[in-house]
Interface confidence: medium
């Protein structure tokens, strides 16, 4: 039996920050679980981890240096990513593992979310169009 995961197909990070919600076909209340967010088609980079147990005190960390946080809903985990770089535009996959109570459960691979990080480009002011041609 596998948990199904729903994610937005695409998100745009305009201010180098984005909230990605992972929705599960499973209620995480009073469960010991490990929710994680992975970057790349091969999910090679573990961006952020949210670990929860019955006390409902979440442990959140990124061993890959991302600025991330997480919030828990009954059937969802929302990852908050900040200080993203343009070159971190990629596809991101939600993963969930339920360790307790038995049986161990994990998810079918989701379709992922493309996070498009928009850089902050300085635009020339229309008040100063530059030198005009004679």
């Amino acid at each position: 039996n596998k948990i199904l995961v729903k994610q937005s197909p695409m998100l745009v990070a305009y201010d180098n920050a984005v909230n990605l919600s992972c929705k599960y076909s499973y209620n995480l209340f009073s469960r010991e679980f490990r929710a994680s967010l992975h970057k790349g088609l091969d999910s090679a980079v573990e961006v952020c981890v949210v670990y929860g147990n019955y006390s409902q005190q979440l442990q959140v960390y990124s061993k890959t240096g991302f600025n991330c946080d997480g919030k828990l809903g009954n059937e969802s985990v929302t990852f908050y990513l900040q200080n993203l770089y343009v070159n971190q535009t990629d596809i991101y996959f939600c993963k969930i593992e339920v360790m307790y109570p038995p049986p161990y459960l994990d998810n079918e691979k989701s379709n992922g979310t493309i996070i498009h990080v928009k850089g902050k480009h300085l635009c020339p002011s229309p008040l100063f169009p530059g030198p005009s041609k004679p």
Partner: nanobody, 123 residues
Framework: EVQLLESGGGLVQPGGSLRLSCAAS????????MIWVRQAPGKGLEWVST????????YYADSVKGRFTISRDNSKNTLYLQMNSLRAEDTAVYYC????????????????WGQGTLVTVSS
């Protein structure tokens, strides 16, 4: 090398306030939940409070709820603990730690601890 340096402790009268600071270096501070724990004289370690990496979530032990406030400034790599309405039973050495280090403190992560700062509440 990971370094955590606590400061701000001291002697305070019951009902008084203190603000503890913890300056972190040697790891990616904004990437980890951080905690305060304390050790009263002759007692074991007691968890006090946790804050998530970007400060979205905070947690407190029942014994300090409503009196202590945890916060962090990721731009300064610094963790804080504002302690109000202090009681004699708050007397302890206060330590900050990266949360995974605390949960795995029987392992090699034990180095992720500071020297602590002593808080004495007495009249």
């Amino acid at each position: 090398e990971v370094q955590l340096l606590e400061s701000g402790g001291g002697l305070v009268q019951p009902g008084g306030s203190l603000r503890l600071s913890c300056a972190a270096s040697g790891f990616t501070f904004p990437a980890y939940s951080m905690i305060w724990v304390r050790q009263a004289p002759g007692k074991g370690l007691e968890w006090v409070s946790t804050i998530s990496p970007l400060g979205y979530s905070t947690y407190y032990a029942d014994s300090v709820k409503g009196r202590f406030t945890i916060s962090r400034d990721n731009s300064k790599n610094t963790l804080y603990l504002q302690m109000n309405s202090l009681r004699a039973e708050d007397t302890a050495v206060y330590y900050c730690a990266e949360q995974t280090a605390y949960l795995n403190r029987a392992t090699e992560h034990f180095d992720y601890w500071g020297q602590g700062t002593l808080v004495t509440v007495s009249s």
